[in-house]
Amino acid sequence: EVEKTACPSGKKAPEIDESLIFYKKWELEACVDAALLATQMDRVNAIPFTYEQLDVLKHKLDELYPQGYPESVIQHLGYLFLKMSPEDIRKWNVTSLETLKALLEVNKGHEMSPQVATLIDRFVKGRGQLDKDTLDTLTAFYPGYLCSLSPEELSSVPPSSIWAVRPQDLDTCDPRQLDVLYPKARLAFQNMNGSEYFVKIQSFLGGAPTEDLKALSQQNVSMDLATFMKLRTDAVLPLTVAEVQKLLGPHVEGLKAEERHRPVRDWILRQRQDDLDTLGLGLQG
């Protein structure tokens, strides 16, 4: 509709304000200056634009910044972020943690969208590694974030960042991921004393080798059964009955309830019956 392309007299927007919600789409296109919009992006969030109107505002920004938005605009996108495609986001260079937080806030409480996944990927690649502050932020918004990374991606996590990891952040990690994270955790916590060290390392033990489990068995750690059940089968098999007894302490009685499940089942089959009998649990090898 060519006749609608010129801004009607008196409708040119001097600023981004609530009056614009009454503009039709073509009026927004014709009467809102893209540069003005870019400088007043922080106001858009507070104005109840429809999604159709947000489409027009996005289009204006796309025309102004065909190579991708500057960070000064990205930081104030707010709900307009929901209109961005992963392709749009790949053009961005986001370096500020504050910008990342502002955009994650828009998505807060919901599963990670493709947009958010792309944003995080761009941000982490831009930083070169997953530093502690970034990891802190990401796991606060998405507790499962760490376990969504491939072992290759996890290899870029510096040991110092491991301090930001909470036990629940590892709930959905598989053994391949824990294989990568465990040595980093071991390095990060190496200067802690026995009991404190065990508290910190416990959630990473799914990646621990046999020799480390043997060492822990000498430290009266009293590992619970839930942790024991997450250990690598190949790491548990070489342990002796005496070592497992020391590792579990008072929790050793829990082996009976788990005797049909790995790694307990496989470990029992590797032991001499005489040794198993010393536990007094009725375990049959």
């Epitope: 507070a46 109840p48 709900y79 929901l82 828009v106 409480g109 969208s113």
Partner: nanobody, 119 residues
Framework: QLQLVESGGGLVQPGGSLRLSCAAS????????MGWYRQGPGNERELVAV???????SYADSVKGRFAISMDNDKHTVYLQMDSLKPEDTAVYYC?????????????WGQGTQVTVSS
């Protein structure tokens, strides 16, 4: 998803009043604004009034001083009190809600309720 159901439309004489209601159900969390639009015969759909989840209301010039929008956050319901109605207010009135988070961001619309102002 989010469902919107309008009620309260009808036939009224010029100068009379009507109160429209719109009840939201389903994914009512994250509604950031609700509003009323109308579409008269042969016209485009136009915004009449909108209210944000923080209670800020805005009105089209043509209804200022005559219409009042309000929201009951607990009941997830928005109302439009229409006084001093004129024949030019005749239209189908549509309720609208903005939901501004994943997994279903977007504008949600009701089916519309007919308002006819005629003597």
């Amino acid at each position: 998803q989010l469902q919107l159901v309008e009620s309260g439309g009808g036939l009224v004489q010029p100068g009379g009043s009507l109160r429209l209601s719109c009840a939201a159900s389903g994914s009512v969390n994250s509604i950031t604004a609700m509003g009323w639009y109308r579409q008269g015969p042969g016209n485009e759909r136009e915004l009449v009034a909108v209210i944000t989840d923080r209670g800020r209301a805005s009105y089209a010039d043509s209804v200022k001083g005559r219409f009042a929008i309000s929201m009951d956050n607990d009941k997830h319901t928005v109302y439009l009190q229409m006084d001093s109605l004129k024949p030019e207010d005749t239209a189908v009135y549509y309720c609208n809600a903005h939901r501004r988070t994943w997994p279903h961001p977007g504008d949600y619309w009701g089916q519309g309720t007919q308002v006819t102002v005629s003597s």
